[in-house]
Interface confidence: low
């Protein structure tokens, strides 16, 4: 369960991969596409609104939280659209939705070494947002293997 329906804090940040590729969003045929690309120097990075929530239930791995609670986030690159996990298709999609947001829009936030973060699906513990073939996908991570796997690491910059 998520403590309260209001976020405890919000921030606007651009999202990039561990290898400094930008996550960008483009409206095509009335739906949003998500791209992972090298940005030209003069192009502005897309911003995402991150809303932070406290969760009483830890995920399958103890990540960094606040006072022992897990931090959950939702990510919204534009008004009324949120990133959502599609566990059937192993994909990450942008959907228009109203509040209260579905569970698929919530991700457990894990801090990694040197300020990288990863996003674990609330609906599918052990599955993370990752980069696959230049797009975002859901990637299953074996905790006994490499949690620091580059393809699930992201950097947030203001």
């Amino acid at each position: 369960s998520i403590t309260g329906i209001s976020p405890i804090t919000e921030s606007l940040a651009s999202l990039s991969t561990y290898n400094d590729q930008s996550i960008t969003f483009a409206l095509e045929d009335e739906s949003y596409e998500i791209y992972v690309e090298d940005l030209k120097k003069d192009k502005k990075k897309d911003k995402v609104l991150l809303s932070y929530y406290e969760s009483q239930h830890p995920s399958s791995e103890s990540g960094d939280g606040v006072d022992g609670k897990m931090l959950m986030v939702t990510l919204s690159p534009t008004k009324d659209f949120w990133l959502q996990a599609n566990n059937k298709e192993h994909s990450v999609e942008l959907h228009k939705c109203e509040k209260p947001l579905p569970d698929q829009a919530f991700f457990v936030l894990h801090n990694r070494s040197f300020n990288c973060v990863s996003f674990e699906c609330k609906t599918d513990p052990g599955v993370f947002i990752g980069v696959k073939d230049n797009h975002l996908a859901l990637i299953k991570v074996d905790y006994s293997e490499n949690l620091g796997s580059e393809n699930i690491l992201f950097k947030l910059s203001e």
Epitope: R112, F114, E150, S157
Partner: antibody, heavy 119, light 110 residues
Framework: EVQLLESGGGLVQPGGSLRLSCAAS????????MHWVRQAPGKGLEWVSS????????YYADSVKGRFTISRDNSKNTLYLQMNSLRAEDTAVYYC????????????WGQGTLVTVSS | QSVLTQPPSASGTPGQRVTISCSGS????????VNWYQQLPGTAPKLLIY???MRRLGVPDRFSGSKSGTSASLAISGLRSEDEADYYC???????????FGGGTKLTVL
């Protein structure tokens, strides 16, 4: 004012132990990765250890692995470094440093505390 | 022996431009941001440049950073006497799971 203040340094014999503390103020300590960095007299900076905001992720330099233990008490806004089996080569000024969430770099440093290992 | 390699010393006259290099490998500089720190005599280090080329707030624009491949550099233009200090580069190393520093460069303003 954002501040880090180290304490606990001093003279210790080889094989001895010491616990360093770093008191944080002026910021939400529990939100930040914290690190220890040391500097031997007249030498360069050497990273020692880091700990994530809720102690889930801990890293050590090979030179101190198995001898030093980093920990933190978020309720006391304090970072610790327990140093055991000290050697002469551990003699250094020990700095605690905050890893800035915006900078991905050590944006705040303490003034340092000197640890001397000598018989 | 430091993982990142810097020249031990550099010098210049007031008003000049000096560059300090920092070379590493694919597991550190090649894959991660480089940070630069300034340490004035008898004081704790201070962050100058983060994310390879971003100046920290309050740092004069005479200081600039760049990165190419597995090397990085710090350039100081319009050198001033107060720039006399030790300069260190640092980066995260993926294989060591550690922060690695350069050995430091002592900058002398002649």
């Amino acid at each position: 004012e954002v501040q880090l203040l180290e304490s606990g340094g001093g003279l210790v014999q080889p094989g001895g132990s010491l616990r360093l503390s770093c008191a944080a103020s002026g910021f939400t300590f529990s939100n930040y990765y914290m690190h220890w960095v040391r500097q031997a007299p007249g030498k360069g900076l050497e990273w020692v250890s880091s700990i994530s905001s809720s102690s889930s992720y801990i890293y050590y330099a090979d030179s101190v692995k198995g001898r030093f233990t980093i920990s933190r008490d978020n309720s006391k806004n304090t970072l610790y470094l327990q140093m055991n089996s000290l050697r002469a080569e551990d003699t250094a000024v020990y700095y605690c440093a905050r890893l800035g969430t915006r900078h991905d770099a050590f944006d705040i440093w303490g003034q340092g505390t000197l640890v001397t290992v000598s018989s | 022996q430091s993982v990142l390699t810097q020249p031990p010393s550099a010098s210049g006259t007031p008003g000049q431009r000096v560059t300090i290099s920092c070379s590493g490998s694919s597991s550190n500089i090649g894959n991660n941001a480089v940070n630069w720190y300034q340490q004035l005599p008898g004081t704790a280090p201070k962050l100058l440049i983060y994310a390879s080329n971003m100046r920290r707030l309050g740092v004069p624009d005479r200081f600039s950073g760049s990165k190419s491949g597995t090397s990085a550099s710090l350039a100081i233009s319009g050198l001033r006497s107060e720039d006399e200090a030790d300069y260190y580069c640092a980066a995260w190393d993926d294989s060591q799971k550690a922060v690695v520093f350069g050995g430091g460069t002592k900058l002398t303003v002649l």
